[in-house]
């Protein structure tokens, strides 16, 4: 059989090979397509409902003056010559129609590196046979479930219609450090070959990094926090930011009832100050910002200095501030 | 992975109020602090207010002191922003999001958009 394609909506005519080329003439269609039950005969006589579907013309041509869905299928022509010889035609014909151009809905203006975001829905109208979305990073393909890239596709059909709505939702996990500015696409691939591809208006969402990049530094002396049963150690919380923010110190995950102070110092260190000290920057535009907490410990006598001690009771002794 | 998924967000009038949910599944064990952050369009992302899970300690931005609320639910493993006195300037989506301490966020949720009308 020969392959024909035709678009939606078009006219087109189907040669019946060694027909007279006007009457009279011996040649039936034979029709085998959505429309019909089995094999529905066309003779050049015509008439009735089918002459708006199809119809033989003058030269025994097939004629359908808008192709549908349901004209899919095929369509064999039996034609006698004035000789007698016989001549077969069979075409297998297949539709399609070409959407209107894809467009990314819904899609977000930044994207937070290190954790999965919606980049935005890529949706295709009008589409037979249903073809296929894809979307590009900078140009390239992305290949979903690879280096965080999940993509979550729906295929709609219109019930009156029969065309195809296409959509595509792209989740993407931006590398720390990477493109600050990616830019996205998204194109649709007809069902049929020979074909191009439509592309979207490409998108270009800023990509946030979440952690600062400077750390909030928390020296201790003596290092390692471990020190013997009255002596002192000082806390002082080191912050990159200008101008300094507030700083505010916490024991074992609670703040301590203090003034906001860059320095601590817990002098005449008795169990009651073991624990887990941290302290806590507060920043007008992104919020607090916490040190690694360290931990403060009593070596007994003769006892080496662990480089970390345990976390000891709640209790504060005393606290001085610098 | 810790998942974060925010609810509540929508349209409200000037001095309405709305909450925010934020729902935490997954490894919540490498949690301890979580926040909330908002970003207007065309501008930065900023800092609303933040928590410890434990409830010990909150935090909150100048400009929604007095008005937000942070808080949490344990046994639903939800954190909450209550949102009073709301004002047009505080339209913006929302962000819950979650980390080991305060200001070292390694989880983000994908944001609720809340409009607040005139």
């Known amino acids: 059989a020969q392959n024909i394609t035709a678009r939606i909506g078009e006219p087109l005519v189907l040669k019946c090979k060694g027909a007279p080329k006007k009457p009279p003439q011996r040649l039936e269609w034979k029709l085998n397509t959505g429309r019909t039950e089995a094999w529905k005969v066309l003779s050049p006589q015509g008439g009735g409902p089918w002459d708006s579907v199809a119809r033989v013309l003058p030269n025994g041509s097939l004629f359908l003056p808008a192709v549908g869905i349901q004209d899919e299928g095929i369509f064999r022509c039996q034609a006698m010559n004035r000789n007698g010889k016989e001549t077969k035609s069979n075409y297998r014909v297949r539709v399609y129609q070409i959407p209107g151009k894809p467009e990314i809905v819904d899609s977000a203006s930044e994207l937070t590196a290190g954790v999965p975001n919606k980049v935005g829905t890529c949706v295709s109208e009008g589409s037979y046979p249903a073809g296929t979305l894809s979307w590009h990073l900078d140009g390239k393909p992305l290949v979903p479930n690879e280096k965080g890239v999940s993509v979550k596709e729906q295929t709609r059909r219109h019930p009156e219609t029969g065309l195809f709505t296409l959509q595509s939702e792209l989740m993407v996990t931006p590398a720390r450090g990477g493109d600050p500015r990616p830019t996205f696409s998204c194109s649709f691939s007809p069902g049929l070959p020979r074909h191009r591809a439509l592309r979207t208006a490409p998108i270009q969402p800023r990509v946030w990094e979440p952690v600062p990049l400077e750390e909030v530094q928390l020296v201790v002396e003596p290092e390692g926090g471990a020190v013997a049963p009255g002596g002192t150690v000082t806390l002082t919380c080191e912050v990159p930011a200008q101008p300094s923010p507030q700083i505010h110190w916490m024991k074992d995950g609670v703040p301590l009832p203090l003034p906001p102070s860059p320095v601590l110092i817990l002098p005449e260190i008795g169990p009651q100050d073991q624990g887990t000290y941290s302290c806590v920057a507060t920043h007008s535009s992104h919020g607090p910002q916490e040190s690694r907490a360290v931990s403060i410990s009593i070596i007994e006598p003769g006892e080496e200095g662990p480089t970390a001690g345990s976390v000891g009771g709640s209790g504060l002794g005393t606290l001085a501030l610098a | 992975e810790v998942q974060l998924v925010e609810s509540g967000g929508g349209l409200v009038q000037a001095g309405g109020s709305l909450r925010l949910s934020c729902a935490v599944s997954?490894?919540?064990?490498?949690?301890?602090?979580f926040g909330w952050f908002r970003q207007a369009p065309g501008k930065e992302r900023e800092f609303v207010s933040a928590?410890?899970?434990?409830?010990?300690?909150?935090y909150y931005a100048d400009l929604v002191k007095g008005r937000f609320t942070i808080s949490r639910d344990n046994a639903k493993n939800t954190v909450y922003l209550l949102m009073n006195s709301l004002k047009p300037e505080d339209t913006a989506v929302y962000y819950c999001t979650a980390g080991k301490r305060y200001g070292y966020y390694d989880y983000w949720g994908q944001g609720t958009q809340v409009t607040v009308s005139s």
């Open positions: 928590m410890r899970w434990n409830g010990s300690s909150s």
């Open positions: 997954g490894r919540t064990f490498s949690t301890d602090a």
